[in-house]
């Protein structure tokens, strides 16, 4: 069918509560495109009827609510004027109950479930609620160890819990709860968050910063050798992994047989407040199949991509 397949990360979700996933894949979805959702390679698109428990809402797939049988691989097909991409999203549903907020043992957990507060600082936790505009979210309540949080040090501000003067005792299991309204029906959303405390505020907080690349394209001739650095700043005591991936697979694994594209050895320079890490990707020979494919640099929760592009023809040579 001429569509290019892209495999996204697994999403691990909670049964009996709403869930939504937005089909966006920069730079593909930045122009005029049509998006259609399918389940498990079905030829029949997901319903667009808003009364359906599972339906497509603009570029989103919306589950109201998620159920056990909803686990599986969902595809969203993005059709542009000259392109077609099929994005595969693996959704795994597990049963999470009220106050079951310690979910660190689950595989591939999103970092939304694991957050850090900085000792002695004013900091915040975020309740990640990703839903389309048709969903109206009520005020958020916050819990710790199954009890509602209160006290002058805690302030709820939109989707955040502000914690002033963070102490070691603020570690533990939190949950944020909101009521979602859609088409006159109400649903409860409950997200568990495991919170740890770190003593260092570090360089720019706890999230690694990718200095380069910056989600851009690189013009490169077919058949040439190309080396691209990923430069990352991070705290000195960080435990983040830095790597290059393509189609959500480590490049060394993806090109295991040909070894045509490889990840380099990581190096770092130590500064007083932070470290600067560099890990490169080497294309021994750029092939046609490499063009238009996002090569992602990952650093903890941060990502940035490059896309190889054929140079525009130079008409001055003719």
């Amino acid at each position: 069918d001429g569509c290019k397949d892209i495999f996204m990360k697994n999403e691990i979700l909670s049964a009996s509560q709403p869930f939504a996933f937005n089909c966006t894949f920069p730079p593909i979805t930045s122009g005029e495109v049509s998006v259609t959702w399918y389940k498990n390679s079905s030829k029949i698109p997901v319903s667009k009827i808003i009364q359906s428990r599972i339906h497509q809402d603009e570029t989103w797939i919306l589950f109201l609510p998620m159920e056990w049988g909803d686990s599986g691989v969902y595809q969203c097909v993005i059709k542009g004027r000259d392109s077609c991409h099929r994005i595969h999203v693996n959704l795994t549903v597990f049963e999470k109950h009220w106050c079951d907020t310690s979910i660190g043992g689950l595989p591939n957990l999103s970092d939304e479930y694991k957050q850090i507060l900085h000792l002695g600082k004013d900091d915040s936790l975020t309740c990640h609620l990703h839903f389309p505009k048709s969903c109206v979210l009520g005020p958020i309540k916050w819990y710790k160890d199954c009890n509602e949080i209160k006290g002058e040090r805690f302030t709820v501000l939109e989707t955040r819990l502000l914690v002033s003067n963070v102490s070691a005792e603020d570690r533990g299991n939190y949950a944020c709860q909101a009521i979602l309204t859609h088409s006159g029906k109400q649903y409860e959303v409950l997200n568990g968050i495991t919170v740890s405390i770190t003593e260092r505020a570090g360089y720019g907080g706890s999230v690694p910063k990718i200095i380069y690349p910056k989600n851009h394209s690189i013009e490169v001739q077919l058949g040439t050798t190309l080396i691209v650095d990923c430069n990352v700043t991070d705290t000195k005591d960080n435990t983040n992994l830095r790597c290059w991936r393509v189609n959500n697979t480590l490049v060394d694994d993806y090109y295991d047989e040909s070894k045509r594209i490889r990840e380099g050895v990581e190096t770092h320079v130590s500064f007083r407040e932070h470290n600067l890490y560099t890990v490169n990707i080497t294309f021994l020979e750029v092939k046609m199949e490499d063009y238009g494919l996002p090569f992602m640099c990952h650093a903890g929760v941060s990502t940035a991509y490059i896309i190889l592009q054929l140079p525009a023809p130079d008409f001055r040579a003719y």
Epitope: K96, H97, W98, C99, D100, T101, S102, I103, G105, K144, D145, C146, N147, K150, G151, E152, R153, F154, N165, S167, E169, R171, G172, N173
Partner: antibody
């Protein structure tokens, strides 16, 4: 570090009341619930109730409802547990336990003996 | 109210033995369960928080796990200082409830 220091042992007559104190230090007192747990001689642990120092909200176990009163003095970071209409089966060690993270820290215990 | 059924009520073991203590909740409590060690005349000391998180300073021979509403405390290699009484506590919903306790004695 976190410390919960309780008042000393008490001997009471049946029908009387006892008030046990628990002074907290080393953490933000008004941010977390404080629980009371008791243990009769040679027996297991029994949750009595809890209080939040921020707004004095209380939750009591059904068994102690009407007999127990938990109060707080924010100025001294102290929580109090008063048990009235004492009977011999109330003879126990009474502990306060903070819920900074669920029942993380415990006081040293206060022995209350009810005897005629 | 949620009942916590702890077993065995007592056990005799030798230094170096692997010891397993179980608590069963009468209804779902998620991971909201702690394990405590208590020695005579002392306050309980928390060993494990939220089913499986080891408290700071607690030896790694202690571990906690869960299967549905069954919770297990395991001591991989019993040491002389481990002879004590162990309790589980559910804090998923009040009234909070403890298991009846397991006394670990020297064989």
């Amino acid at each position: 570090q976190v410390q919960l220091v309780q008042s000393g042992a008490e001997v009471k007559k049946p029908g009387a009341s006892v008030k046990v104190s628990c002074k907290a230090s080393g953490y933000f007192f008004t941010s977390y619930w404080m629980n009371w747990v008791r243990q009769a001689p040679g027996q297991g642990l029994e949750w009595m109730g809890m209080i939040h120092p921020y707004d004095s909200e209380t939750r009591y176990a059904q068994k102690f409802q009407g007999r127990v009163t938990m109060t707080v003095d924010k100025s001294t970071s102290t929580v109090y547990m008063e048990l009235s209409s004492l009977r011999s089966e109330d003879t126990a060690v009474y502990y306060c336990a903070s819920s900074t993270t669920a029942f993380a820290y415990w006081g040293q215990g206060t022995l209350v003996t009810v005897s005629s | 109210d949620i009942q916590m059924t702890q077993s065995p009520s007592s056990l005799s073991a030798s230094v170096g033995d692997r010891v397993t203590i179980t608590c069963r909740a009468s209804q779902d409590i998620g991971n909201a369960l702690n394990w405590y060690q208590q020695k005579p005349g002392k306050a309980p000391k928390r060993l494990i928080y939220a089913t499986s998180s080891l408290d700071p300073g607690v030896p790694s021979r202690f571990s906690g796990s869960r299967s549905g509403t069954d919770f297990t405390l395991t001591i991989s290699s019993l040491q002389p200082e481990d002879f004590a009484t162990y309790y589980c506590l559910q804090y998923a919903s009040s009234p909070y409830t403890f298991g009846q306790g397991t006394k670990v004695e020297i064989k």
